[in-house]
Each structure stands twice: as structure tokens, then as C-alpha cells.
Amino acid sequence: GCINITSSASQEGTRLNLICTVWHKKEEAEGFVVFLCKDRSGDCSPETSLKQLRLKRDPGIDGVGEISSQLMFTISQVTPLHSGTYQCCARSQKSGIRLQGHFFSILFTETGNYTVTGLKQRQHLEFSHNEGTLS
């Protein structure tokens, strides 16, 4: 089956959610770990990640179609310290499969706002820190 990983972001008020989504077959979930790294060009691993999610096979899901699993990393307030390059990754301990998502960046600007760039689904997100709006 085709396994892939995508990165996305959403904002709720001052909160920024960074989301890593892995698409996989139901039976492939066991032994899969999804993780998010910051400023790690070559050594992104569960051990060096900001957050990781170990997938479990859900017996409640019927059929053998493709399903998705999400890791969500929530930043309550983006600060200049969050500026950097992020990457969603995944690996399977059973099959040895390694997935690496596209690099995306958070840039905190001098105006006190921040932008998220490099996301595949929406190429450029700009967030106003004070207003809590997406423009």
C-alpha cells in the first residue's frame, strides 16, 4: 500500500497547532511512530523529536481501506524562540519504512506576528499574533 505523511497547521486564538498526518492501511498501524522535529536537518528521530505518537491498531475500524493518524503539537503562544525549521517524520519498527515530510518553517517577525511557510496543502499561512486571525 501507499504510505505517506503530510504537514499542516491551524490556528485557534493564540494557539498554533502543528499537525503531522500519516496515511496508511489499518494493518500497518502497529509499530508505527510519528514524530515532529525542529532544526534537525539529518538526525530527526523519535529520540530527538519535540513530540512523538506511537500508533496502535484500532480494532474498531472496519475494512482494509486507507486511514489517517494524526500527531498534533500545540504551541499556546508563538514566540521568537519558535522560529526555525520543522519536519514531520514517521517510521515503522516492523517494516523498517521511514517517512520524511517536507520541511516547513515558522518565522517570527519584527512586528510581533509570525508566518508558517513551506506547507504543502496551503503554501503560506500568515498569523497575526495579537488579533488571533488568519490572513
Epitope: K38, R40, T48, I75, S76, P80, H82, G112, H129
Partner: antibody, heavy 119, light 107 residues
Framework: EVQLVESGGGLVQPGRSLKLSCAAS????????MAWVRQAPTKGLEWVAS????????YYRDSVKGRFTISRDNAKNTQYLQMGSLRSEDTATYYC????????????WGQGASVTVSS | ETVLTQSPTTTPASPGEKVTITCRAS?????MHWYQQKSGASPKLWIY???KLASGVPNRFSGSGSGTSYSLTINNMEAEDAATYYC??????????FGPGTKLEIK
């Protein structure tokens, strides 16, 4: 449990320099932004400086800009605060602290290093 | 710069009493955090993101507030709660600011 151990404090004359070190252990140091927070005798807490996890971007309170330099060595799991042109008002206990990544708090604190600036 | 003021400066409380410490900001802030510091010890993170208790904090503590007014409440004061409590916030460009502290004493 996260461990942060400061060293390098002491008595120094006004105008002189001093370098504080903070040895970190029991966590993935290179993942965390770090900071220094100080507390003057019988006074409250005051943020001094912060440094980002990977890129090494640095931020300072206005009163120490140009005099203090925060740095880190991820290979040695250590952060530093080089303090120059010291003034009597810099007299304080300096705490090495970790930034919580998902919030704007300082979640782990060292035991503190005492710095006294006096002639 | 956003300035934080705390009240009261010092407050004595009896065991079992309900205690409320207030932190006011000179301009609206998104979250408030609280630290506990006992005499001769380092501060400890106590409450973060306005209302979340840090690991190991007894559930007699709670935090609330929004905008410019925030509070820390102890429902049944215990002797071990005697300490100085500091509020803290983040905003740009002043970054991290703390309140002056409230000293909570046991009667």
C-alpha cells in the same frame, strides 16, 4: 528528572566580567530553548536572556543588552552567560531555566548561582 | 512593556482557609503563569496557561482569569502552602515579565 547545575558565581568588582555555566542532564538538551532568570536579594524575579534550541538565536532584557551574552554548547549539554561591564544592580542569584516548548513558561530551574558586584 | 502588579503583597492565612492572590496586567495578556518559591529555594512552576496545574501540584490550587485580571486560589490552605507566589506572562517585544510576588504566611 531534569537537572540543571549552575557554576561560576562569585564576588566581582564593578566594570569587570564573569561567566556563568549551566550543566544540563537527564533530558534532550538540544531540543530546548534555555534562559537565565535572576533574583536580586530580597527582590522578585527578572528574566535576563533566552537562547533558542538549534539556531542559537538570542534575546535579552534591555538593561543587559550589549553587556551580557547568552550562548550554548549542545555537544556539552551546557549553556553560558558571559556578563561584562558589571554593575551593582546586577547583584543577584542567577537561575538557569528551561523554556517549555508548548507554553511561555520556565518549567525547570537550577539551584542558582550567586553573583555579587561590589568594590 | 506590560507591567504586572500583585495583591496583596503579604497575606496571613489560617489552615483550611480559602486564599486568593490576584495579578493584574497593565495591558491585556493571553495567559498567566504562576510560580511558588519557598525561602532559600529555587522557584517552581506551579500553574501554567492560566489554569493548568504543573506536575505534582495539589488540586486544592486553581488558576483563572482573562484579559488584565488573573488569580491563583487555594481552596483549603495548608501549612506547606506558605511561600511567595509570582505571576508571569509573555508578550512582544518585552518578552517575559514577572509580578513582584505575594508572600503567603501561615497564621
Amino acid at each position: 528528572e531534569v537537572q540543571l547545575v549552575e557554576s561560576g558565581g562569585g564576588l566581582v568588582q564593578p566594570g569587570r566580567s564573569l561567566k556563568l555555566s549551566c550543566a544540563a542532564s537527564r533530558f534532550t538538551f538540544s531540543n530546548y530553548a534555555m534562559a537565565w532568570v535572576r533574583q536580586a536579594p530580597t527582590k522578585g524575579l527578572e528574566w535576563v536572556a533566552s537562547i533558542s534550541s538549534g539556531a542559537g538565536n538570542t534575546y535579552y532584557r534591555d538593561s543587559v543588552k550589549g553587556r551580557f551574552t547568552i550562548s550554548r554548547d549542545n555537544a556539552k549539554n551546557t549553556q553560558y552567560l558571559q556578563m561584562g561591564s558589571l554593575r551593582s544592580e546586577d547583584t543577584a542569584t542567577y537561575y538557569c531555566v528551561t523554556h517549555n516548548y508548548e507554553s511561555t513558561v520556565f518549567d525547570y530551574w537550577g539551584q542558582g548561582a550567586s553573583v555579587t558586584v561590589s568594590s | 512593556e506590560t507591567v504586572l502588579t500583585q495583591s496583596p503583597t503579604t497575606t496571613p492565612a489560617s489552615p483550611g482557609e480559602k486564599v486568593t492572590i490576584t495579578c493584574r496586567a497593565s495591558s491585556s495578556v493571553s495567559y498567566m503563569h504562576w510560580y511558588q518559591q519557598k525561602s532559600g529555594a529555587s522557584p517552581k512552576l506551579w500553574i501554567y496557561d492560566t489554569s493548568k496545574l504543573a506536575s505534582g501540584v495539589p488540586n486544592r490550587f486553581s488558576g483563572s482569569g482573562s484579559g488584565t485580571s488573573y488569580s491563583l486560589t487555594i481552596n483549603n490552605m495548608e501549612a506547606e502552602d506558605a511561600a511567595t507566589y509570582y505571576c508571569q506572562q509573555w508578550n512582544y517585544p518585552s518578552m517575559y515579565t514577572f509580578g513582584p510576588g505575594t508572600k503567603l504566611e501561615i497564621k
